[in-house]
Interface confidence: low
């Protein structure tokens, strides 16, 4: 039902859903700190623009009695319960920040009259694509899919001279929330990725994955998986791997590859790591000192959600426009705003654009090196290392099907 918004007369409120079920197991206190740091910045920016208004956040906690799995499995009802709580208290802000789980976002979007914007740190799944009042500040599955298709088709680089059209996808059901939806998108038979590939098989058992590594009858040399190097090691160990196997390890929200003095373990030599170009201002900020690299991205998304709201509020106030209108609710897209860590670009559907980075392990230095970058905004790949010191033959990525074409 329609809830009146605390969003006028110089006082603007942000409703922040503090859900027990979250895309990342982050103490809610850290997210509060992130939101509060964002509020300080927004207040300063509005003041500098000569806009004498009040901006606050209301943190809406669920009781946690029923929906306490801690992950996203029971988030659907928790999100709706929180909305009911907001409705009963008549305390809806100008914007809703959270939820982060795909299930809850999808259901909340369906079950509410969305005359206000929703900003999510997560909601990675394809079911949350193309939602008119939803903004997602962490790379959704669609962006990953577009990179993979672009990379598979690329055949004009010194280190990749073959188009690929096949892949195995390893998905065993124990994945984190982001990985679950990324792999789900690749598995879906109607997705862009599946449509563009000629062969794709999902490996669901550890043994299936392990067998493929040396199987002479395998249908593809390329295996996509999602997680960190430790996850790969648990699965692969020190097993021998055929020389033309390429493992693509999707590990978007992990800065560890960029830290000083990081050496790539030997089991990573057949692996290309797909991650995001890191930011750094959070390293010294008050709320992030104790955060892991992944959690830093999650907290940053909450903070940037606040900054995005401040950006839009400033524009609408300067233009003398009303905040509680569908126009405002639909405005959080197709723009660039000043995020905490530099400019943040949102695409036509309100999804964050980013620079994805494909890393390889140099056989000379045992360091992670950048092979190429990919700009999700323009769907374009930019080669970086034209002479990579690969483990693969002739310093080129192999064909995806053994024995097809010159090796």
């Amino acid at each position: 039902s329609q809830v009146s918004q605390n969003c006028h007369n110089g006082s603007y409120e942000i409703s922040v859903l503090m859900m027990g079920n979250s895309a990342f197991a982050e103490p809610l206190k850290n997210l509060e700190d992130a939101v509060n740091e964002g509020l300080e910045i927004v207040r300063g920016r509005l003041q500098n623009a000569g806009l004498n208004v009040t901006v606050n956040a209301t943190f809406m906690y669920s009781d946690g009695l029923i929906h306490n799995s801690g992950d996203c499995r029971s988030s659907t009802c928790e999100g709706l319960d929180l909305l009911r709580k907001i409705s009963n208290a008549q305390r809806m802000g100008c914007v809703l920040i959270g939820p982060s789980c795909t299930y809850s976002t999808f259901q909340m979007y369906l079950d509410t009259e969305l005359s206000y914007p929703m900003i999510s740190a997560g909601s990675f799944g394809l079911s949350c694509d193309y939602k008119e009042t939803l903004t997602r500040l962490m790379s959704p599955a669609r962006k990953l899919m577009y990179f993979l298709v672009n990379f598979w088709k690329t055949n004009d680089l010194p280190f990749k001279t073959y188009s690929w059209s096949t892949s195995y996808v390893y998905k065993n059901g124990t994945e984190t929330e982001d990985c679950f939806w990324y792999l789900n998108a690749l598995e879906a038979s109607v997705s862009y990725f599946s449509h563009e590939l000629g062969f794709k098989v999902v490996l669901r058992q550890d043994k299936e994955f392990q067998d493929i590594l040396m199987d002479h009858n395998r249908k593809s040399n390329v295996i996509i998986m999602c997680g960190g190097p430790e996850f790969l090691y648990k699965l692969k160990g020190d097993r021998a791997v055929a020389e033309d196997i390429v493992i693509i390890l999707v590990d978007l929200f992990n800065d560890q590859y960029f830290e000083d003095n990081v050496t790539a373990p030997d089991y990573m030599k057949n692996v290309l790591v797909l991650t995001l170009s890191p930011g750094n201002s959070l390293l010294n900020s008050s709320f992030s000192r104790n955060l892991s690299p992944t959690k830093r991205d999650f907290a940053l998304a909450y903070l940037n959600g606040i900054l995005l709201f401040g950006h839009m509020l400033k524009i609408f106030l300067e233009n003398g426009e009303n905040i509680t209108t569908p126009k405002f609710a639909h405005a959080f897209r197709n723009l660039t705003f000043e995020g905490y860590d530099g400019p943040v670009t949102l695409d036509d559907w309100g999804d964050v654009d980013s620079t994805m980075v494909l890393l390889y392990t140099s056989v000379d230095t045992k360091k992670y090196k950048v092979l190429l970058t990919y700009d999700t905004h323009v769907n374009k790949t930019y080669p970086v290392d034209m002479s990579p010191t690969f483990t693969w033959k002739n310093s080129k990525l192999p064909n995806d099907i053994t024995g097809r074409g010159p090796q």
Epitope: P278, N280, D341, G342, L359, K367, K369, V370, P383, V384
Partner: nanobody, 133 residues
Framework: QVHLVESGGGSVQSGGSLRLSCAAS????????RGWFRQTPGKEREGVAT???????SYADSVKGRFTISQDNAKNTLYLQMNGLKPEDTAMYFC???????????????????????????WGQGTQVTVSS
């Protein structure tokens, strides 16, 4: 190799302003950031200001609040607006482009003028700035 050409230097009184420009041409696909450095005779080249590909600026403490670095990616040009110039700003100013394939180079902290290792950097020829009291 990237070709960098600086312009805009000259002589100015203390408290005055200058705007330096740097036009870049050639392959820039591996750029991490661009920046301005300066050097006085007998001293090491020091970082003044840098800006990442996404537009994140960093400044040496000695110029913070007085100098502003900016870029026009469409024109492939880097700028340094210098206000409140002091005699100690007198130096040869160089434009630089930082490039590397190492993952760590993508880290914006590496692009801070105080922390910038000078491997993988293309330099311009420099433009002289003289500030008299």
């Amino acid at each position: 190799q990237v070709h960098l050409v600086e312009s805009g230097g000259g002589s100015v009184q203390s408290g005055g302003s200058l705007r330096l420009s740097c036009a870049a041409s050639g392959y820039t696909g591996r750029r991490l950031c661009r920046g301005w450095f300066r050097q006085t005779p007998g001293k090491e080249r020091e970082g003044v200001a840098t800006i990442t590909l996404s537009g994140r600026a960093s400044y040496a403490d000695s110029v913070k609040g007085r100098f502003t670095i900016s870029q026009d990616n469409a024109k492939n040009t880097l700028y340094l607006q210098m206000n409140g110039l002091k005699p100690e700003d007198t130096a040869m100013y160089f434009c630089a482009e930082v490039r590397s394939a190492d993952a760590e180079w993508l880290n914006p902290l590496k692009c801070h003028p105080d922390r910038l290792g000078l491997a993988g950097v293309d330099w311009g020829q420099g433009t002289q700035v003289t500030v008299s009291s």
